[in-house]
């Protein structure tokens, strides 16, 4: 505990001497002196400290607010915060998952390119020529038009990005 200018990475300079930092999961209750080491105390339940520190309070565990669509993904410990995620059918709107939003369905004429995850929304793309999607969906991709020719049928109605082609019997030559 003697005089030193540069303290180690698990120490801090206090009143001209190097004191031990408190380990993760604890907090400072008394700075070191020439006669005593740093005094630390474990974080209370519902609190944490993630790093070596000299703070007199631990941090409160995060509350995953159900009214905001949040639920607990991983319970907090004395050394880590609670991790929140969104309920089924929703995704986080920020990196820290502070709020949730409903997954966006792909509307008719658009297909799902990437399904939504707990951190990303659905990625939709317009159905290209020869493909269609006739419903709002969180998972349906664009489907190819039916090939009337392969069924030995003829096209009665052309397909669009939202509708399939309609096939019918070939009319007989008169």
């Amino acid at each position: 505990l003697g005089q030193c200018v540069t303290c180690s990475d698990k120490q801090y300079l206090h009143d001209g001497q190097c004191c031990d930092l408190c380990q993760p999961g604890s907090r400072l209750t008394s700075h070191c002196t020439a006669l005593e080491k740093t005094q630390c105390h474990p974080c209370d339940s519902g609190e944490f400290s993630a790093q070596w520190n000299r703070e007199i309070r631990c941090h409160q565990h995060r509350h995953c607010e159900p009214n905001q669509g949040l639920r607990v993904k991983k319970e907090g410990t004395a050394e880590s915060d609670t991790v929140c995620t969104c309920k089924e059918g929703q995704h986080c709107t920020s990196k820290d998952c502070e709020a949730c939003a409903q997954h966006t369905p792909c509307i008719p004429g658009f297909g799902v390119m990437e399904m939504a995850t707990e951190t990303t929304d659905t990625v939709c793309h317009p159905c290209p020529v020869g493909f269609f999607s006739n419903q709002s969906s969180l998972f349906e991709k664009c489907y190819p038009w039916t090939s009337c020719e392969d069924k030995n049928l003829e096209v009665l109605q052309k397909g669009t990005s939202q509708t399939n082609v309609i096939c019918g019997l070939k009319s007989r030559m008169r």
Epitope: L13, D15, G16, L28, T29, S30, R54, I56, R57
Partner: antibody
């Protein structure tokens, strides 16, 4: 010698504001959390607010949250308590103190009277 | 909030041993501290973390206890010890003080 000296107390009307400074000397100011503790006339001690080494973390008792702001200027070794929307129940002697989990040095205190 | 209960007053004769008690409404481990306040003065730290004597404080003062029950002992009491004694917990915020025990000498 460690010293903390509060100033700028006085009589103030309800609803008005007052800012208390506390000048510290004799120790490395930025090495300590600092706090304000008050004592109503003939009453006991009541913790008001605390602030971390660099001012990044602040803590308040519920009755002053949103009305009082604790701050510090480490370059000037000075602690402040900005008191807004003052009430009669804020009448007290206000002490500035060095804070770890206990308060090891206290100023002599400054009287704040909230009355019309 | 954690409430700290102290008996309001004590009267003792110089040279006697006196114990001042403080009871917490919840366990505070050893995060209890004791202060002395003389009339017209600021409080002065005597004991920190239940049993550690603050630098410069006479060895006549000692502290003990953990959990919910704590004691400040003065042995022997001197005339200059006339004051109000406060306990304070730092288990969680708000950091709270006891109501104080006024020590009078007979």
């Amino acid at each position: 010698e460690v010293q903390v000296v509060e100033s700028d107390g006085g009589l103030v009307q309800p609803g008005r504001s007052l800012k208390l400074p506390c000048a510290a000397s004799g120790f490395t100011f930025s090495d300590y959390y600092m706090a304000w503790v008050r004592q109503a006339p003939t009453k006991g001690l009541e913790w008001v607010a605390s602030i971390s080494y660099d001012g990044s973390s602040t803590y308040y008792r519920d009755s002053v949250k949103g009305r009082f702001t604790i701050s510090r200027d480490n370059a000037k070794s000075t602690l402040y308590l900005q008191m807004d929307s003052l009430r009669s129940e804020d009448t007290a002697t206000y002490y500035c103190g060095r804070h770890s989990s206990y308060f090891d040095y206290w100023g002599q205190g400054v009287m704040v009277t909230v009355s019309s | 909030d954690i409430e700290l209960t102290q008996s309001p007053a004590l009267a003792v004769s110089p040279g006697e041993r006196v114990t001042i008690s403080c009871r917490a409404s919840d366990s505070v481990s050893t995060l209890m501290h004791w202060y002395q306040q003389k009339p017209g003065q600021q409080p002065k730290l005597l004991i920190y973390l239940a049993s550690h004597l603050e630098s410069g404080v006479p060895a006549r003062f000692s502290g003990s206890g953990s959990g919910t029950d704590f004691t400040l002992t003065i042995d022997p009491v001197e005339a200059d010890d006339t004051a109000t004694y406060y306990c304070q917990q730092s288990w969680n915020d708000p950091w709270t003080f006891g109501g104080g025990t006024k020590l009078e000498l007979k």
